[in-house]
C-alpha cells in the first residue's frame, strides 16, 4: 500500500476492513487485550497499537486481513510522526501560552472528564 | 488546593489564571519551549507538561501564580491517571475491536489530519 494515500482515506478504508474481518478476528476466544476504560483515545495510542500487535500475532494472515494490519501500521506511523511534532519546535513563551490556553480550552469543552 | 475540586472546574479556573498572569509569564524573553505544530493536543501532553515545568522553574513564585502552577500539576495528575487507565483492563477481542472502531471513527471525524 503506498504511504502516499491520504491518512483520512486510510482511516476510512481501515474502518471498512475492520467490519469485514470482525468474525475472523474474534475467533480467538481466550485472547485478552487491554482496553482503555475512558474515551480520551489519543491518550491511549500506545496501548491501542500494542493491542493491535497482539491481535496480529494471533491472526492467520492472508488476503485482505493482511491489508487491514498493513493499514493499521501506516496509521501508527502517521501518529508517531504527529507525536514527533509535539516537541520539535522551540518557540517563545507567548506562543507556548497561546497553545496551553488552546489545550486547556479543548480539555474544558471536548474531553470526556469524569467528576 | 483540595484535589476534590472537580477537574472541569479546575480547568476553568486555570484558564482564568493563565490570562491574569500572562504578562508576568512572558517576561522571560530568552526562554524557548517546545510548541506542538498541530492541534492533536492529547498526543502531546508529555511535552506540554515538560514545557510547564520549564516555565515554572523560570517564574518567580508567590501569590496566585503559585496557584496557577499548582492547578496545572493537578491537571497533570488527572491526565496521568487517565493514561494509567489505558492499559489496566484486559478484555476480550470483541471489546477491543469495538474500542478500536471507536478510536478510528474519532480519528476519522475529530482528529486534525493533514493531507
Amino acid at each position: 500500500i503506498p504511504t502516499e494515500i491520504p491518512t483520512s482515506a486510510l482511516v476510512k478504508e481501515t474502518l471498512a476492513l475492520l467490519s469485514t474481518h470482525r468474525t475472523l478476528l474474534i475467533a480467538n476466544e481466550t485472547l485478552r487485550i487491554p482496553v482503555p476504560v475512558h474515551k480520551n483515545h489519543q491518550l491511549c495510542t500506545e496501548e491501542i497499537f500494542q493491542g493491535i500487535g497482539t491481535l496480529e500475532s494471533q491472526t492467520v494472515q492472508g488476503g485482505t486481513v493482511e491489508r487491514l494490519f498493513k493499514n493499521l501500521s501506516l496509521i501508527k506511523k502517521y501518529i508517531d510522526g504527529q507525536k514527533k511534532k509535539c516537541g520539535e519546535e522551540r518557540r517563545r513563551v507567548a506562543q507556548f501560552l497561546d497553545y496551553l490556553q488552546e489545550f486547556l480550552g479543548v480539555m474544558n469543552t471536548e474531553w470526556i472528564i469524569e467528576s | 488546593i483540595p484535589t476534590e475540586i472537580p477537574t472541569s472546574a479546575l480547568v476553568k479556573e486555570t484558564l482564568a489564571l493563565l490570562s491574569t498572569h500572562r504578562t508576568l509569564l512572558i517576561a522571560n524573553e530568552t526562554l524557548r519551549i517546545p510548541v506542538p505544530v498541530h492541534k492533536n493536543h492529547q498526543l502531546c501532553t508529555e511535552e506540554i507538561f515538560q514545557g510547564i515545568g520549564t516555565l515554572e522553574s523560570q517564574t518567580v513564585q508567590g501569590g496566585t501564580v503559585e496557584r496557577l502552577f499548582k492547578n496545572l500539576s493537578l491537571i497533570k495528575k488527572y491526565i496521568d491517571g487517565q493514561k494509567k487507565k489505558c492499559g489496566e483492563e484486559r478484555r476480550r477481542v470483541a471489546q477491543f475491536l469495538d474500542y478500536l472502531q471507536e478510536f478510528l471513527g474519532v480519528m476519522n471525524t475529530e482528529w486534525i489530519i493533514e493531507s
Epitope: Y99, G105 | P36, K39
Partner: antibody
Framework: QVQLVQSGAEVKKPGASVKVSCKAS????????INWVRQAPGQGLEWIGY????????RYNQKFKGRATLTVDKSTSTAYMELSSLRSEDTAVYYC????????????WGQGTLVTVSS | DIQMTQSPSSLSASVGDRVTITCKAS??????LSWIQQKPGKAPKTLIH???RLIDGVPSRFSGSGSGQDFTLTISSLQPEDFATYYC?????????FGQGTKVEIK
C-alpha cells in the same frame, strides 16, 4: 483546493469602520490560524494580528489594539477583520493569510481587499 | 518589537544572474523566518519557511540560509518571472514583523 477569498473593495469616510471578510474553503477551518496583514500604497507589509478559529482566541499587534477586531464565523468558515476610527493612513490593501501550523509560516494568502479612506 | 532590516532595498539584474538578498533581525529569531515574493498588484506568496525550507511547488533556484540574526535569500539563476519584490518575515515573536522589501528589477 485550499483557498481564501476576500470581500470586495471598500471606500470609507474618516472616523467610520470597515469589516473585511475572508472565506476559507478546501480545508477544515478550525485547524489553522488566520492572520491579517496590510499594505499601504507603495509600502511594505504590516502584521495586524491572528485569530485561532478553534477557540476564537486572537492576538493583536499593539499598534492596532483597540481599533482592530478579529472574529470568525465557524458555520460559514469565514474570518473577519474590523477596523474602526478609520483615518487616511489606513488606506491599504488588507490580506488574510493562513498559518500552516501553530504560529507557523503563511502558506495560503487571500487575494486582498483595498480599503480607501477618504473624505 | 523585532526589527527586520533588509538589503539592498532594490537591485537591477539580468536573466541568468545569481541574486542575493539579506535580512538582519534586531535579535535572535532562531530560524523562524520566511521569504515572501510579491508581484505588482498581486497577493504575496511564501517561497521559503524556517529560513531554508523550500515550499512545495517553488522552483529549486530559490534557496534560503541563516539562523539567529542573519539570513539570506538566493536566486541561483534569475528567470523573467522572478522580477518582483521580496520580503522577509519573522514569525518567532509577536508582533510578527516584515523587512521593508527588496525590489528586483530588470537591468
Amino acid at each position: 483546493q485550499v483557498q481564501l477569498v476576500q470581500s470586495g473593495a471598500e471606500v470609507k469616510k474618516p472616523g467610520a469602520s470597515v469589516k473585511v471578510s475572508c472565506k476559507a474553503s478546501g480545508y477544515t477551518f478550525t485547524n489553522h490560524h488566520i492572520n491579517w496583514v496590510r499594505q499601504a500604497p507603495g509600502q511594505g507589509l504590516e502584521w495586524i494580528g491572528y485569530i485561532n478559529p478553534y477557540n476564537d482566541y486572537s492576538r493583536y499587534n499593539q499598534k492596532f489594539k483597540g481599533r482592530a477586531t478579529l472574529t470568525v464565523d465557524k458555520s460559514t468558515s469565514t474570518a473577519y477583520m474590523e477596523l474602526s476610527s478609520l483615518r487616511s493612513e489606513d488606506t491599504a490593501v488588507y490580506y488574510c493569510a493562513r498559518d500552516y501550523g501553530n504560529f507557523w509560516y503563511f502558506d495560503v494568502w487571500g487575494q486582498g481587499t483595498l480599503v480607501t479612506v477618504s473624505s | 518589537d523585532i526589527q527586520m532590516t533588509q538589503s539592498p532595498s532594490s537591485l537591477s539584474a539580468s536573466v541568468g544572474d545569481r541574486v542575493t538578498i539579506t535580512c538582519k533581525a534586531s535579535q535572535d529569531i532562531n530560524s523562524y523566518l520566511s521569504w515572501i515574493q510579491q508581484k505588482p498588484g498581486k497577493a504575496p506568496k511564501t517561497l521559503i519557511h524556517r529560513a531554508d525550507r523550500l515550499i512545495d511547488g517553488v522552483p529549486s533556484r530559490f534557496s534560503g540560509s541563516g539562523s539567529g540574526q542573519d539570513f539570506t535569500l538566493t536566486i541561483s539563476s534569475l528567470q523573467p518571472e522572478d522580477f518582483a519584490t521580496y520580503y522577509c518575515l519573522q514569525y518567532d515573536d509577536f508582533p510578527y514583523t516584515f523587512g521593508q522589501g527588496t525590489k528586483v528589477e530588470i537591468k
